[in-house]
Amino acid sequence: KNLKSPQKVEVDIIDDNFILRWNRSDESVGNVTFSFDYQKTGMDNWIKLSGCQNITSTKCNFSSLKLNVYEEIKLRIRAEKENTSSWYEVDSFTPFRKAQIGPPEVHLEAEDKAIVIHISPGTKDSVMWALDGLSFTYSLVIWKNSSGVEERIENIYSRHKIYKLSPETTYCLKVKAALLTSWKIGVYSPVHCIKTTVENELPPPENIEVSVQNQNYVLKWDYTYANMTFQVQWLHAFLKRNPGNHLYKWKQIPDCENVKTTQCVFPQNVFQKGIYLLRVQASDGNNTSFWSEEIKFDTEIQAFLLPPVFNIRSLSDSFHIYIGAPKQSGNTPVIQDYPLIYEIIFWENTSNAERKIIEKKTDVTVPNLKPLTVYCVKARAHTMDEKLNKSSVFSDAVCEKTKPGNTSK
């Protein structure tokens, strides 16, 4: 009896694991084995696929084959008993294109009101993702074990901290990886659960803000209790993206070590240009708080987020406001190459009732004004990145009188 070729061959690639599955064509024939050959692009000869020769099951693993994952390959399979079936050719494919991202490894640490999540690629030193290691982003789903109400957090890196949780509560989460450059979304990790600790005696410092004064940065925060000492640490923000290494070398800011006030001042030259994370910890001599929420600190934005400069064209029932780049000393405009949003406050000169307009555009109309009335306007800029969340100070107020009626055209 002629052996039929196997059918419906599926190639599953997860990270560096290459699995083949297929259907037997004839279930009634026993003791059949299966063998695969492969062929690389531009080659005529077929090569035996190691790990997939004389297989008795309908699955085999050819992960040991060192392939160029960006190169197209073709496979063929046949059944063997005393004789052999004809070859069945599988559609050619490129491993990288076909590959799925496997479940990442997840490591959790608990505090009283926070969980630290460390994420690593599921396959260490993966060949498949060797060129993409730093491009992985992750997303997670987290829920209270007791309620099951899910919250999704997108676009996180290999270290992420979730704040504002409840003490002594079990939280569960699962994480998946994505390579947005290749439009690849991975599979979820197993569910990991961890219980937050009993509430700490000392809360962490809150509301950390950085401002610039002269040639110094001023770091301020709020704290519940008096007679405390504080320390501040920084970390290069890009280190959160490092996929394999989970040793984060936070550094002290020398002028912010063991300070007794809820602020510290340090020279701007402590930091080179870049984006940093800052965190603050409180101590009363016996006990120590957990670290505060980490704030993102961009030296470029911090130094140059100046109040906007604007001109007003007055009409009878409105102002047209034209926002320009702020000026540095020497009257040169500052180039701000990050998106800004403008907050414009205006009020009648004789009144304290302020109205507000938020606008992304640099030409703004302030409507519904009364003719021949003096209105004052001030403006400030905000960064649109909610993680940076920086604002300039307000500009000086500019006051203008609206025109007489019927000049709105």
Epitope: E109, N200, N245, L247, Q252, N287
Partner: antibody, heavy 118, light 107 residues
Framework: EVQLQQSGADLVRPGASVKLSCTAS????????IHWVKQRTEQGLEWIGR????????KYAPKFQVKTTITADTSSNTAYLQFSSLTSEDTAVYYC???????????WGQGSTLTVSS | DIVMTQSQKFMSTSVGDRVSVTCKAS??????VAWYQQKPGQSPKALIY???YRYSGVPDRFTGSGSGTDFTLTISNVQSEDLAEYFC?????????FGGGTKLEIK
């Protein structure tokens, strides 16, 4: 394979100085912290301090701040623990340890025995 | 400084038994605790980190648990080679501190 090879036993006089060494293989010390830990006979473990070999930044336990200095030479992948004004209280085994992921001590050297005696 | 207290200096057990070594921190350390095993005449060896994660190569009869201030290292199905001293350590705040150690004796 990760290894931390420490210098051998030292017998020194009280008041003298000594420098213990710890040479790493199988990893680059710049990517980690190197810690030093003291253990006296039949006693527990005491953390002395650590260095970040990448930039030389150090941290010490207050009781060892004056007595010890930790340094590192990245070109030879070696960390050092130097003592000054030794007393019999400094007689102990000293371990160098790698501070790895999540700050934990994942690999320990074999220990250097320091004996201070007249 | 954070004090790590291992109240039992010695514990006696038999092969095949289950034993729990405890450690108490003087303040909340989250889950930033490690456990080490030191056999006579040897360097300490890392067993557990982040309170409950086992290092690769460590037999799964070693289990860590706890958070906040109370931590436990459990050895189920004790083997004769588990004769050693066990230390806990906090790795959240400098100076890092160790417990005084618990010596496990096999009957």
């Amino acid at each position: 394979e990760v290894q931390l090879q420490q210098s051998g036993a030292d017998l020194v006089r009280p008041g003298a100085s000594v420098k213990l060494s710890c040479t790493a293989s199988g990893f680059n010390i710049k990517d980690y912290y190197i810690h030093w830990v003291k253990q006296r006979t039949e006693q527990g473990l005491e953390w002395i301090g650590r260095i970040d070999p990448e930039d030389g930044e150090t941290k010490y336990a207050p009781k060892f701040q004056v007595k010890t200095t930790i340094t590192a030479d990245t070109s030879s992948n070696t960390a050092y623990l130097q003592f000054s004004s030794l007393t019999s209280e400094d007689t102990a085994v000293y371990y160098c340890v790698r501070g790895g992921n999540f700050y934990y001590f994942d690999y320990w050297g074999q220990g250097s025995t320091l004996t201070v005696s007249s | 400084d954070i004090v790590m207290t291992q109240s039992q200096k010695f514990m006696s057990t038999s092969v095949g038994d289950r034993v729990s070594v405890t450690c108490k921190a003087s303040q909340n350390v989250g889950t930033n605790v490690a456990w080490y095993q030191q056999k006579p005449g040897q360097s300490p060896k890392a067993l557990i980190y982040s309170a409950s994660y086992r290092y690769s190569g460590v037999p799964d009869r070693f289990t860590g648990s706890g958070s906040g201030t109370d931590f436990t290292l459990t050895i189920s199905n004790v083997q004769s080679e588990d004769l050693a001293e066990y230390f806990c350590q906090q790795c959240i705040n400098y100076p890092y501190t160790f417990g005084g150690g618990t010596k496990l004796e096999i009957k």
